[in-house]
């Protein structure tokens, strides 16, 4: 069987629960990015997450080799009816995938959105958002995921994740 | 044009209607897996489904070569809403992607979820769930898809499908 | 670092606003296809869209090299709910991915669907649909995306897109 190992430029990083730094503060460096950046990804959970010729720094995947990458993320929004006055029933759940280059502001690559059920009878909501696409990245570019309504994210490793691989 | 053929490790298998064994019985071997495994995939529908250096057995894709695989599935939930005496049974539609290794229990790789509309005006529901991610698999590992509310799945070949390919 | 460039067969094309020909007329050549074909894709927006060994013609990606392609698209449906007496508020949002071969009619590869919220309280809707899968394509095959309710599509480049890459 041929050896493919050295060819591999890929990552799949997964949500991890219970860290206080799961999401960046609203005024962190990516304040020009919409939503809040997810910081707390796990990259070495056996059989579930890994990094291969990509680095992970501050919730961002850092590119080591230029090329076209298929980049994807899934975020799992979960919430329930709660007695909270002065809150609107509807929630906009948006997942953004950004890149940083030598340009100072983050550049939006993809966005995917859902709004929650408007019915007053709604008891809870489950909404997974997946998106992915191909982008040309250069060495030292960084990619990250941000979301609206970050407190609704289920950061189980199988529910919310972020990944990329070099194509061709 | 260069010959890529021998490099290819890939599969795209599609839903097929009207078989009695579309879904495993609730007490079949994967009872430790959430949901019900989809058994009835078609792998040789010209132009739509294929297997290339992967096998299909009992609804599971069987790995022949170790490496990092992008694994994906789409399941299409479709139903009429039944209003029964002022009750509304919300539906949780969840798609799970599992792997079997030498470890006896299946290991959950990804899950994606949606709940149906709570409004009493709802007459029907259409909900496609797609998810995909990169995972390291070994020879003889097996991957499969299971779902909740399996009776709601539209098993048209273009609507519900399951696939994987070796990356890099 | 090894040179991967010549290996690459890939495209990511993005929505573009404000063109009158964004969607094909209902009676254009693909009348046998469900929905309306999206014509107005952009293929050379720096850092966002590109073509590499694939052509774009009339909204269709034209294959130059046979092989297995991962094909994907995202379409972002966005609308205000209009309150109209005695009318049903529900919308079916379907995304189709088709191919043309030497056979005269388009062949449906994938379809993904959502219906909008039924609630009378609904004020607006945000629904992104993503799907992707692996298909064998031959030289001169063409692939395209069509949608129902095309007037609801947000053609921002980061919201609606279409892409493919050669696997293995």
């Amino acid at each position: 069987v041929r050896e493919r190992g050295p060819q591999r430029v890929a990552a799949h990083i997964t949500g991890t629960r219970g860290r206080s730094n799961t999401l960046s503060s609203p005024n962190s460096k990516n304040e020009k990015a919409l939503g809040r950046k997810i910081n707390s990804w796990e990259s070495s959970r056996s059989g579930h997450s890994f990094l291969s010729n990509l680095h992970l720094r501050n919730g961002e995947l850092v590119i080591q080799e230029k090329g076209f990458y298929y980049i994807y993320s899934q975020t799992y929004f979960r919430f329930q009816e709660e007695i909270k006055e002065n809150t609107k029933n509807d929630k906009q759940m948006v997942q953004y995938i950004y890149k940083y280059t030598s340009y100072p502001d983050p550049i939006l690559l993809m966005k995917s959105a859902r709004n929650s059920c408007w019915s007053k009878d709604a008891e809870y909501g489950l909404y997974s958002i997946y998106q992915g696409g191909l982008f040309e990245l250069k060495k030292d570019d960084r990619i990250f995921v941000s979301v609206t309504n970050e407190h609704l994210i289920d950061m189980d490793h199988e529910a919310s994740f972020f990944g990329a691989f070099l194509v061709g | 044009v260069r010959e890529r053929g021998p490099q290819r490790v890939a599969a795209h298998i599609t839903g097929t209607r009207g078989r009695s064994n579309t879904l495993s019985s609730p007490n079949s071997k994967n009872e430790k897996a959430l949901g019900r495994k989809i058994n009835s995939w078609e792998s040789s529908r010209s132009g739509h489904s294929f297997l290339s250096n992967l096998h299909l057995r009992n609804g599971e894709l069987v790995i022949q070569e170790k490496g990092f695989y992008y694994i994906y599935s789409q399941t299409y939930f479709r139903f009429q809403e039944e209003i029964k005496e002022n009750t509304k049974n919300d539906k949780q539609m969840v798609q799970y992607i599992y792997k079997y290794t030498s470890y006896p229990d299946p290991i959950l790789l990804m899950k994606s979820a949606r709940n149906s509309c709570w409004s009493k005006d709802a007459e029907y529901g259409l909900y496609s769930i797609y998810q995909g991610g990169l995972f390291e698999l070994k020879k003889d590992d097996r991957i499969f898809v299971s779902v909740t509310n399996e009776h709601l799945i539209d098993m048209d070949h273009e609507a519900s499908f399951f696939g994987a390919f070796l990356v890099g | 670092v090894r040179e991967r460039g010549p290996q690459r067969v890939a495209a990511h094309i993005t929505g573009t606003r404000g063109r009158s020909n964004t969607l094909s007329s209902p009676n254009s050549k693909n009348e046998k296809a469900l929905g309306r074909k999206i014509n107005s894709w952009e293929s050379s927006r720096s850092g966002h869209s590109f073509l590499s060994n694939l052509h774009l013609r009339n909204g269709e990606l034209v294959i130059q090299e046979k092989g297995f392609y991962y094909i994907y698209s995202q379409t972002y449906f966005r609308f205000q709910e209009e309150i109209k007496e005695n009318t049903k508020n529900d919308k079916q949002m379907v995304q189709y991915i088709y191919k043309y071969t030497s056979y005269p009619d388009p062949i449906l590869l994938m379809k993904s669907a959502r219906n909008s919220c039924w609630s009378k309280d609904a004020e607006y809707g945000l629904y992104s649909i993503y799907q992707g899968g692996l298909f064998e394509l031959k030289k001169d095959d063409r692939i395209f995306v069509s949608v129902t309710n095309e007037h609801l599509i947000d053609m921002d480049h980061e919201a609606s897109f279409f892409g493919a890459f050669l696997v293995g």
Epitope: E82, K120, E123 | G35, N86 | -
Partner: antibody, heavy 115, light 107 residues
Framework: EVMLVESGGGLVQPGGSLKLSCAAS????????MSWVRQTPEKRLEWVAT????????YYPDNLKGRFTISRENAKNTLYLQMSSLRSEDTAMYYC????????WGQGTSVTVSS | DILLTQSPSSLSASLGERVSLTCRAS??????LSWLQQKPDGTIKRLIY???TLDSGVPKRFSGSRSGSDYSLTISSLESDDFADYYC?????????FGGGTKLEIK
Amino acid sequence: EVMLVESGGGLVQPGGSLKLSCAASGFTFSNYGMSWVRQTPEKRLEWVATISGGGSYTYYPDNLKGRFTISRENAKNTLYLQMSSLRSEDTAMYYCAAPTAMDYWGQGTSVTVSS
Amino acid sequence: DILLTQSPSSLSASLGERVSLTCRASQEISGFLSWLQQKPDGTIKRLIYAASTLDSGVPKRFSGSRSGSDYSLTISSLESDDFADYYCLQYASYPRTFGGGTKLEIK
């Protein structure tokens, strides 16, 4: 502060009827689903009924359908449970809870079915 | 119906000890599980919802976690106020169901 206060419990003969009330305060009552739960003398908790905020939907376990009816009067911020054809096994402490995920509980009202 | 199997049914422990209670769901409940505490006077209070979210005002020694269909309530260091009955509740679907309860007693 959310407050739920149950009333209407007491001693009733088998086959008899009883109507429980739950007075709610501290939140916009009409926006939220409400439930009744009972606790048997053996300390087992059993869900009895749920009603949606607008009253459109009502839910019961199969074994209580037809005998128990949940209702609400949003103008009065009050939840009700009408119980009929009572049996000895309906003897329990009855609690109201809000909303449908049961974030808040009342202090309970005791129902004894005995001849 | 979704069956919640709660264990143990009773537990004797000492002040300062760490204890864990478990609830296993027979079907997927998507994390829609809460833990309730009932004091001897009959008062019921929710401690945790959505499997792991602490209710406001609940001491941080209480925590909830999930592994697949197994849900746990952990008290990191028992205090005298914690000796009570504990129940799990699933609110993912109807009928709502409760675990059988755990009586936590002082050793």
